[in-house]
Amino acid sequence: LRPSRVYKPEGNTKRALTLKDILNGTFSYKTYFPNWISEQEYLHQSEDDNIVFYNIETRESYIILSNSTMKSVNATDYGLSPDRQFVYLESDYSKLWRYSYTATYYIYDLQNGEFVRGYELPRPIQYLCWSPVGSKLAYVYQNNIYLKQRPGDPPFQITYTGRENRIFNGIPDWVYEEEMLATKYALWWSPDGKFLAYVEFNDSDIPIIAYSYYGDGQYPRTINIPYPKAGAKNPVVRVFIVDTTYPHHVGPMEVPVPEMIASSDYYFSWLTWVSSERVCLQWLKRVQNVSVLSICDFREDWHAWECPKNQEHVEESRTGWAGGFFVSTPAFSQDATSYYKIFSDKDGYKHIHYIKDTVENAIQITSGKWEAIYIFRVTQDSLFYSSNEFEGYPGRRNIYRISIGNSPPSKKCVTCHLRKERCQYYTASFSYKAKYYALVCYGPGLPISTLHDGRTDQEIQVLEENKELENSLRNIQLPKVEIKKLKDGGLTFWYKMILPPQFDRSKKYPLLIQVYGGPCSQSVKSVFAVNWITYLASKEGIVIALVDGRGTAFQGDKFLHAVYRKLGVYEVEDQLTAVRKFIEMGFIDEERIAIWGWSYGGYVSSLALASGTGLFKCGIAVAPVSSWEYYASIYSERFMGLPTKDDNLEHYKNSTVMARAEYFRNVDYLLIHGTADDNVHFQNSAQIAKALVNAQVDFQAMWYSDQNHGISSGRSQNHLYTHMTHFLKQCFSLSD
């Protein structure tokens, strides 16, 4: 027997993190995002649940809605109408999928100081929102869209086709919510509140995934979800626009699909209102390398939306799929014709382009061996965007301003030198025309949120600096975090290493690789985190490494598209390469290397364990994909094509975890899955387990009854991390 190794952090003034700290969320941080209601005013929910109004210029602040009013209906969220006469209060939050939930809504009249009675909203509502002007309400109930001109008015029913699990109006079905829109809604008001655009998803022909939900009853109930797996029939999608000025005079008008898209299976990808009578729709072929942006105009004389061919802009990828994870959306300029958009340049780096007439004539606005990530706001004279340009670190995010009023446009980094050590990863929240903005820094130091003047970029005030967290971390021994790159052949891999306190290069440490590795993801980010792996380094003396291999984002298409049509190859290979490099560094105990991952990371960790290299002693896969045929069509096919003989069936079959069952014989494998996983179905782990049993390979497994892909219920999460900790400590011969 190998003697047990106990890691003792030296110096007893500070204590190590405990697993309890992590499970209790003791060291969680706060961010501050203003809820902008004008150019210089915003709302924010205080610690004690009052809704507070702030005016930056007059420095006035007051409670617009008291916590007692919130409490009276157990409200957890709110929304102010643009005319500031009403507030909706949201309660009875009931989660559905990743973004979707249902809730009960109450309308509070701020003028009268009472709840609106008469024509109360039905319950539960699937989505509700105010119009951008006034106080019209659109909401979705039982898959149909309703409209109220004022909160106390009777509703107009806009759609009648809605049917549970069959037809969805104004809300996405499962696959569109998760893999295309990343929202709980599929309706959009025009800027003046005249029109309401919405999508109808017809899932009538989609196969159903069914799984048991055990609950407390004598019999489990069955959850049925129309869920198109790779190659299956997809939702049929139509976009309509209704004139909310005449809901009973004019029916919803369908927006035509571009011919080149409609000729075969296609997706709707996003809708952007350009002006009160101009809308921009984005469509995508089922083979997701061709995207079409279509600009449509309202023809009042026809009561129709016209999308001329000369207002169709095609984006095509010849090396992979269109866009990053999603196809980028346009940021229109004031002329309501030209727009800015991020797409790959000739060198394969994603950059901002200015499109005035055709994509072919696009003017490249940013360039370099880095990527523009998001366009926040385009104003009359400025364009604000984020990128990872600064100092060449792909895992950083800084905010830049391009003065588009100048010729040539001048570029300024707004955040690069603000708090250089503390803050290297920013996002921002802008008032309507960017007169003011908030910067939210996520790290690598303690997160901090600040308010800035949109013209001078001057900091006006600190909104949240996490002082309490700073104080509570004073007596904690935190690990040291390094972000570096390693080279192998012609490839460069960025990695993050979390080193135990008092790390000594002359000693040997166990190594845990945490992997995600999915296409267009990024794990090596300059952000603050105190989580399970922080604890493992702090208390258990484990070195943690995260590596961004091929297929990960923001380092150019050559690196990103390397995995196209062959998932499960290079992602794994690059983790193995990194491990070998880490061993060469001299402080890793080769006998004690483990890998773990969740979801796509569970897939990669499983394949890495089954690589036959002998590098890993043990590993954990939580909710892993085991075959791309089992996963959602939109995702699987984006990166793998179709599972058909004349397309890519062969690699679909070759890239399964089950095909490598024999190779698990010499590793300790812990397989974990929630039985109510709507996303990566339990089927994936069931098939891995079956293959391992058939191969007579021993392994460990844990299921979490009625838990979804996040295994996030308090008790389950505690059990999960405790269980994984025991498994790892046993694997690394660390005593309890």
Partner: antibody, heavy 125, light 107 residues
Framework: QVQLQQSGVEVKKPGASVTVSCRAS????????IHWVRQAPGQGFQWMGW????????HHAQDFQGRVAMTRDMSTDTVYMELTSLRSDDTAVYYC??????????????????WGQGTLVTVSS | EIVLTQSPSSVSASVGDRVTITCRAS??????LAWYQQKPGKAPKLLIY???SLQSGVPSRFSGSGSGTDFTLTISSLQPEDFATYYC?????????FGGGTKVEIK
């Protein structure tokens, strides 16, 4: 007082066209939609469409697509409804009716509060 | 389109009687319903709008109720001038549609 005065009886052959006029008086012509509704002998009502006199915008029911045209003359406060390619089943009394809601706030429906006296159109060979 | 079904199609009643006419919508229409009265050879006359609001100048013996799919027109005490045909009309969604009518006749 507020009223809508329609043109007189029409007899037409199949394939022909008919134009019915409706003159408004007693209120601001531009402020209210005018709808057209027909009633076949011994039958119920069929809504045909509307015109917004303020802007001349029209919209009609699918059943009449391509066959009906609604226009207005602001100088005489008159709206016109032309129905083409007449068939025998177009025989009906045609009514113009004022929408009680204002064109400025058309989303509240208060019913058709003023009707014309009706125009009988007979289509027969 | 939304179909409105009126019942009964005809009713015989005497002066002073309470008469109730129902209108059922094939789908929910909230309160967007109007009632009209039509006498032979005449244009219809608006009685009730928004399901229950009495049009000005209409006697208070007429009342409307209901929301969603089921609506009622009630004449509390029938008068000689009330013998006519009554129609409901929905305005929740395009196209606007009318019920088939209910004829109120003298018993």
């Amino acid at each position: 007082q507020v009223q809508l005065q329609q043109s007189g009886v029409e007899v037409k052959k199949p394939g022909a066209s008919v134009t019915v006029s409706c003159r408004a008086s007693g209120y601001s012509f531009a402020d209210h939609f005018i709808h057209w509704v027909r009633q076949a002998p011994g039958q119920g009502f069929q809504w045909m469409g509307w015109i917004n006199p303020n802007r001349g915008v029209t919209h009609h029911a699918q059943d009449f697509q391509g066959r009906v045209a609604m226009t207005r003359d602001m100088s005489t406060d008159t709206v016109y409804m032309e129905l083409t390619s007449l068939r025998s089943d177009d025989t009906a009394v045609y009514y113009c009716a004022r929408d009680a809601s204002l064109t400025a706030r058309p989303y509240y429906f208060y019913g058709f509060d003023v009707w014309g006296q009706g125009t009988l159109v007979t289509v027969s060979s | 389109e939304i179909v409105l079904t009126q019942s009964p199609s005809s009713v015989s009643a005497s002066v002073g009687d309470r008469v109730t006419i129902t209108c059922r919508a094939s789908q929910g229409i909230s309160s967007w319903l109007a009632w009209y009265q039509q006498k032979p050879g005449k244009a219809p006359k608006l009685l009730i709008y928004a399901a229950s609001s009495l049009q000005s100048g209409v006697p208070s013996r007429f009342s409307g109720s209901g929301s969603g799919t089921d609506f009622t027109l009630t004449i509390s005490s029938l008068q000689p001038e009330d013998f006519a045909t009554y129609y409901c009309q929905q305005a929740n969604s395009f196209p606007l549609t009318f019920g088939g009518g209910t004829k109120v006749e003298i018993k």
